[in-house]
Amino acid sequence: GSERACCPVNWVEHERSCYWFSRSGKAWADADNYCRLEDAHLVVVTSWEEQKFVQHHIGPVNTWMGLHDQNGPWKWVDGTDYETGFKNWRPEQPDDWYGHGLGGGEDCAHFTDDGRWNDDVCQRPYRWVCETELDKASQEPPLL
């Protein structure tokens, strides 16, 4: 397949990735599905610079990212290694808090109002950010 040369309309380019910032809220799974339907994934934060870039665009608003521990260990949706990668949790987080009374703990990560991360109930309707890589091969069949 061919490589994507530029970002789709309404997406923002940064360091060879394209980002789309929602203005409405969805549960984590719905946000994850939305990004997948756009041939993208929930944002995966791999560096100081990417954290700052995303933080600038979302402002002080709770926003889902592509990090969860619904199957046990924390995992990035694109397979990026969590243990060795960039982390920006708030102090005392993640805490898998059960005291919210909604059933279960907290298995999905989001940006908080100061940009640092928190784990929360995945059903909360937060904004989200989709990311896709510019050098990712598109799904279109090659021209013959």
Epitope: W48, K52, H56, K87, W89, D114
Partner: antibody, heavy 118, light 107 residues
Framework: QVQLVESGGGVVQPGRSLRLSCAAS????????MHWVRQAPGKGLEWVAI????????YYADSVKGRFTISRDNSNNTLYLQMSSLRAEDTAVYYC???????????WGQGTTVTVSS | DIQMTQSPSSLSASVGDRVTIACRAS??????LNWYQQKPGKAPKFLIY???SLQSGVPSRFSGSGSGTDFTLTISSLQPEDFAIYYC?????????FGGGTKVEIK
């Protein structure tokens, strides 16, 4: 009151090692990232390193990478800078500073002087 | 690495003057720019963060502006205690970098 106090500076020969300490008080040390910043005599400020509140991330200036190690002991409210293979150009006043939102430094210590000389 | 260039490197001004210091980044740093004040023999003092937000306790005569690559620190009416060296600092990218400083002297 919020306070940072550096110690451990002194005169050391090139190639030798030194460990600086920064004692924090008046705030919840374990909730804040911390920096080391240095200032050579008569020169400007040079950032050295940062460590996250929980030690999960550490970043260094290119000039010290591989020679200096930043660490912390949250149980003792202390920040450290282990300096090895010291060079004359490492001579400076070393400040520790509290991090504000990945990079800003809102509280500073009074500094400790390191002189690298034979 | 992102280079930070301040201008002028020094300036002379009188009490009551309006003073402006410029800081330019070698690449876009959005609004991740801080300002510090340092007096001789003392540690730096945090003045302004994210280009224009005044740190708690800093007099309102200090203000910051700019985004992208060009930033400004303004002292609306210079006071005797404002004579010092001022540094800008970018926090968009590591390694974090400071400008070379601007010395504000008494005319």
């Amino acid at each position: 009151q919020v306070q940072l106090v550096e110690s451990g500076g002194g005169v050391v020969q090139p190639g030798r090692s030194l460990r600086l300490s920064c004692a924090a008080s008046g705030f919840t040390f374990s909730s804040f990232g911390m920096h080391w910043v240095r200032q050579a005599p008569g020169k400007g400020l040079e950032w050295v390193a940062i460590i996250w509140h929980d030690g999960s991330n550490k970043y260094y200036a290119d000039s010290v990478k591989g020679r200096f190690t930043i660490s912390r002991d949250n149980s003792n409210n202390t920040l450290y800078l282990q300096m090895s293979s010291l060079r004359a150009e490492d001579t400076a006043v070393y400040y520790c500073a509290r991090d504000l939102s990945m990079g800003g430094m809102d509280v500073w210590g009074q500094g400790t002087t390191v002189t690298v000389s034979s | 690495d992102i280079q930070m260039t301040q201008s002028p490197s020094s300036l002379s001004a009188s009490v009551g003057d309006r003073v402006t210091i410029a800081c330019r980044a070698s690449q876009n740093i959005i609004s991740y720019l801080n300002w510090y004040q340092q007096k001789p023999g003392k540690a730096p003092k945090f003045l302004i963060y994210t280009a224009s937000s005044l740190q708690s306790g800093v007099p309102s005569r200090f203000s910051g502006s700019g985004s992208g690559t060009d930033f400004t620190l303004t002292i609306s009416s210079l006071q005797p205690e404002d004579f010092a060296i001022y540094y800008c600092q970018q926090t968009y990218s590591t390694p974090l970098t400071f400008g070379g400083g601007t010395k504000v002297e008494i005319k």
